[in-house]
């Protein structure tokens, strides 16, 4: 079941997920100047069986000025400097990560995405925390969130993490060691 | 594996109060919602209420209200149950329960055995 | 409140019978969320309940295939194929879809 809301904003911090439980769904969202193609889904789908999971559909942009056409354009320098969020996502994924049963890992950029990845994460769902660059992480407790429900009522724990002036980045929980989810599985990376 | 256990037998003078207490084993409380469950003998099961372990909110069923407080502890992976101004009527066996969820399934899958609530006059 | 009936209060059956057990509620159950949080519970003399069925019709893991779930809006049914031994204890259907969550009042199954 989809979790209602984003999860908890910590100020000066990020958040991820080390993979993406099944029925986990992530919008085809496009860059400025660029559009879904229009027999393209509007999301992909984290689905699987009991053995594999893996991303249904596939995200297409295409230029806003064009007709019909996919063409799609590398992205330019400064492009690229925008694209940062989603390149941090993506070099998270480690090639030598274990395939988590019932989980979906990041799934690679598509050309033209946009700046910003916008999931809609179900039940069961961990995401991990990280002070952004130049502060420093103050922990009371674990730098993660877990959407949690009763009978159609969902709410994400309140991550123990407080972000302080400082100058070197902390590192995401999931990268020092992996963490129970309430699956019992390491759960994966995530940006909204 | 989740596991559930729950404080041993009370018997309580009528008008006094007692605490149960509910410790989980195999997962972290803060992560789930724990609902309480009463059963008097040789009747059905009603339930009390839920509390969010993580931030402390509670619901409760109307007719348990003022009578029972639920309240946990994330340090030591405890749940309670506050029971008031005891009668007879409050003579039953408590439950705690996890209202558990995972890929495939949701619902009260794991639960304490137990702890019988006697009032005496 | 949502007040659950379940029929009947006693079941006597022989094993290897299909038994069939009916919840109604007094409303609706669908959440707003569209799903519909119905579950049945069986408690066995002296032990705690165990869950058999959520939503409606989904079993449990470790629950047999001889248990079965349906309905929809306010009539539910649950359905054992053919009974064992191990299956006799008193039936609980429940709600969630709407505060406060209600139990049924029971239904207990029985050697003929």
């Known amino acids: 079941e989809l979790c209602d809301d984003d999860p908890p904003k910590i100020t000066h911090a990020t958040f991820k997920a080390v993979a993406y439980k099944e029925g986990t769904m992530l919008n085809c969202e496009c860059k400025r100047g660029f559009r879904r193609i229009k027999s393209g889904s509007p999301y992909m789908l984290c689905t699987g069986n009991s053995s594999h999971s893996s991303w249904d559909n596939q995200c297409q942009c295409t230029s806003s000025a064009a007709r019909n056409t996919t063409k799609q354009v590398t992205p330019q320098p400064e492009e690229q400097k925008e694209r940062k969020t989603t390149e941090m996502q993506s070099q998270m994924q480690l090639a030598d990560q274990v395939s988590l049963p019932g989980h979906c890992r990041e799934p690679p950029p598509w050309e033209n995405e946009a700046t910003e990845r916008i999931y809609h994460f179900v039940v069961g769902q961990t995401v991990y925390y990280q002070c952004v660059q130049g502060y420093r992480a103050l922990h009371r407790g674990p730098a993660e969130s877990v959407c949690k429900m009763t009978h159609g009522k969902t709410r994400w724990t309140q991550p123990q993490l407080i972000c302080t002036g400082e100058t070197e980045p902390s590192q995401f929980p999931g990268e020092e060691e992996p963490q129970a989810s309430p699956d019992g599985l390491p759960e994966s990376e995530t940006s909204r | 594996q989740a596991y559930l256990q729950q404080s041993g037998a009370e018997l309580v003078r009528s008008g006094a109060s007692v605490k149960l207490s509910c410790t989980a084993s195999g997962f972290n409380i803060k992560d789930y919602y724990i609902h309480w469950v009463k059963q008097r003998p040789e009747q059905g099961l009603e339930w009390i209420g839920w509390?969010?372990?993580?931030?402390?909110?509670?619901e409760y069923a109307p007719k348990f209200q003022g009578k029972a407080t639920m309240t946990a502890d994330t340090s030591s992976n405890t749940a309670h149950l506050q029971l008031s101004s005891l009668t007879s009527e409050d003579t039953a066996v408590y439950y705690c329960?996890?209202?558990?969820?995972?890929?495939?399934?949701?619902?009260?899958?794991?639960w304490g055995q137990g702890t019988l609530v006697t009032v005496s006059a | 409140d949502v007040v659950l009936t379940q029929t009947p209060l006693s079941l006597p059956v022989s094993l290897g019978d299909q038994a069939s057990i009916s919840c109604r509620s007094s409303?609706?159950?669908?959440?707003?969320?569209?799903?519909?949080?119905l579950e049945w519970y069986l408690q066995k003399p002296g032990q705690s309940p165990k869950l058999l069925i959520y939503?409606?019709?989904n079993r449990f893991s470790g629950v047999p295939d001889r248990f079965s779930g349906s309905g929809s809006g306010t009539d539910f049914t649950l359905k054992i194929s053919k009974v064992e031994a191990e299956d006799l204890g008193v039936y609980y259907c429940f709600q969630g879809s709407h505060v406060p969550p209600t139990f049924g009042g029971g239904t207990k199954l029985e050697i003929k």
């Open positions: 939503k409606v019709s």
């Open positions: 409303q609706s159950i669908v959440h707003s969320n569209g799903n519909t949080y």
């Open positions: 509390i969010d372990p993580d931030n402390g909110e509670t």
């Open positions: 329960t996890v209202f558990w969820y995972g890929n495939n399934y949701a619902g009260f899958a794991y």
